[in-house]
């Protein structure tokens, strides 16, 4: 990387190195030969998360309930607010600027991974021996009933959407 004129946490202004403002503070005035850099703390609902020479702090993110958002972590003078989605919803992007309803897995599919505030439901097709007869954001594929363990026989084969139907064994006369 190219050489720098100043130390870490300094910046060059008027051929002189001045201290940057620490996180949580903004620049009021550059240093001079006789005075240090003047910084001021960010106001309520504002933040700066790096050593900086910004003259304005950034506004904390607003978690808009109309978009399904709620506060996951309140912002400080050094950190932004972190939003997440209401129960049953998830973020549409990493920045979590809006939410969408968790997808449900259709009959014949089960939930492989339950949705979180930041990821959607992951569905998987029910393999042979398993079924799902509901549209759900929580239900996994269920195993077919084992007729044998109930001393019954299969009267109707199962599918990926239906369980087997068990019935009594035919008695030998």
């Amino acid at each position: 990387e190219p050489p720098t004129a100043c130390r870490e946490k300094q910046y060059l202004i008027n051929s002189q190195c001045c201290s940057l403002c620490q996180p949580g503070q903004k620049l009021v005035s550059d240093c001079t030969e006789f005075t240090e850099t003047e910084c001021l703390p960010c106001g309520e609902s504002e933040f700066l998360d790096t050593w900086n020479r910004e003259t304005h702090c950034h506004q904390h993110k607003y978690c808009d309930p109309n978009l399904g958002l709620r506060v996951q972590q309140k912002g400080t003078s050094e950190t932004d607010t972190i939003c997440t989605c209401e129960e049953g919803w998830h973020c549409t992007s990493e920045a979590c600027e809006s939410c969408v309803l968790h997808r449900s897995c259709s009959p014949g599919f089960g939930v492989k991974q339950i949705a979180t505030g930041v990821s959607d439901t992951i569905c998987e097709p029910c393999p042979v021996g398993f079924f799902s007869n509901v549209s759900s954001a929580f239900e996994k594929c269920h195993p077919w009933t084992s007729c044998e363990t109930k001393d019954l026989v299969v009267q109707q084969a199962g599918t990926n959407k239906t369980d087997v139907v068990c019935g009594p064994q035919d008695r030998l006369r």
């Epitope: 870490e8 300094q10 051929s15 002189q16």
Partner: antibody
Framework: QVQLVQSGAEVKKPGASVKVSCKAS????????MHWVRQAPGQGLEWMGW????????NYAQKFQGRVTMTRDTSISTAYMELNRLRSDDTAVYYC???????????????????WGQGTLVTVSS | DIQMTQSPSSVSASVGDRVTITCRAS??????LAWYQQKPGKAPNLLIY???TLQSGVPSRFSGSGSGTDFTLTISSLQPEDFATYYC?????????FGGGTKVEIK
């Protein structure tokens, strides 16, 4: 008391590399930038660059960019300076020198060297 | 880069003499200047920093002055142990640069 002890003299062929060490004691190694300064025989002082032992950040003089690497091992309070593709005009005494404490400086870089290593003579000759 | 020009390059003086060495920067460096003394085969020794502040343990016969581009190191009464080479160094911005040195010799 503060001490900077450097590795011994080296003789290298042109095109080779040299790595000089500087072991610090008597103070908090991560609290002060470490600089490297060289002095060719009968010549003046030439600044090569610095390393911040706390962050590992470095800053090299343009002249040495791409040829010098400064590193540190905080577990043994030692700074290193490696110079590659040596030429005969790299023959010099290489010094490590301790800067003022981190956070001491508010205006200017105010890099003044209150403690120096004893110097390491690097001779580049075919 | 900031060029530092020292003068004279050498000076012959006697014990008890007042010796003045000047250092000029190619651009303003405020008061960010240091002076070092170096004896043959030894590392430099910090005498003065921020143009006029005496480093701890340095005799008071050494003094520094100046700001901007013109600086002076004065030895008020030269002692036998003061025969050495003196360097100025700007500490305003990187790259740090040194003057070419002034050798103080016995007359």
């Amino acid at each position: 008391q503060v001490q900077l002890v450097q590795s011994g003299a080296e003789v290298k062929k042109p095109g080779a590399s040299v790595k000089v060490s500087c072991k610090a004691s008597g103070y908090t190694f991560t609290g002060y930038y470490m600089h490297w300064v060289r002095q060719a025989p009968g010549q003046g002082l030439e600044w090569m660059g610095w390393i911040n032992p706390d962050s590992g950040g470095t800053n090299y003089a343009q002249k040495f960019q791409g040829r010098v690497t400064m590193t540190r091992d905080t577990s043994i309070s030692t700074a290193y300076m490696e110079l590659n593709r040596l030429r005969s005009d790299d023959t010099a005494v290489y010094y490590c020198a301790r800067d003022q404490p981190l956070g001491y400086c508010t205006n200017g870089v105010c890099s003044y060297f209150d403690y120096w290593g004893q110097g390491t003579l690097v001779t580049v000759s075919s | 880069d900031i060029q530092m020009t020292q003068s004279p390059s050498s000076v012959s003086a006697s014990v008890g003499d007042r010796v003045t060495i000047t250092c000029r920067a190619s651009q303003g460096i405020y008061s960010w200047l240091a002076w070092y003394q170096q004896k043959p085969g030894k590392a430099p020794n910090l005498l003065i920093y921020t143009a006029s502040t005496l480093q701890s343990g340095v005799p008071s016969r050494f003094s520094g002055s100046g700001s901007g581009t013109d600086f002076t190191l004065t030895i008020s009464s030269l002692q036998p142990e003061d025969f050495a080479t003196y360097y100025c160094q700007q500490a305003n911005i990187f790259p740090l640069t040194f003057g070419g040195g002034t050798k103080v010799e016995i007359k």
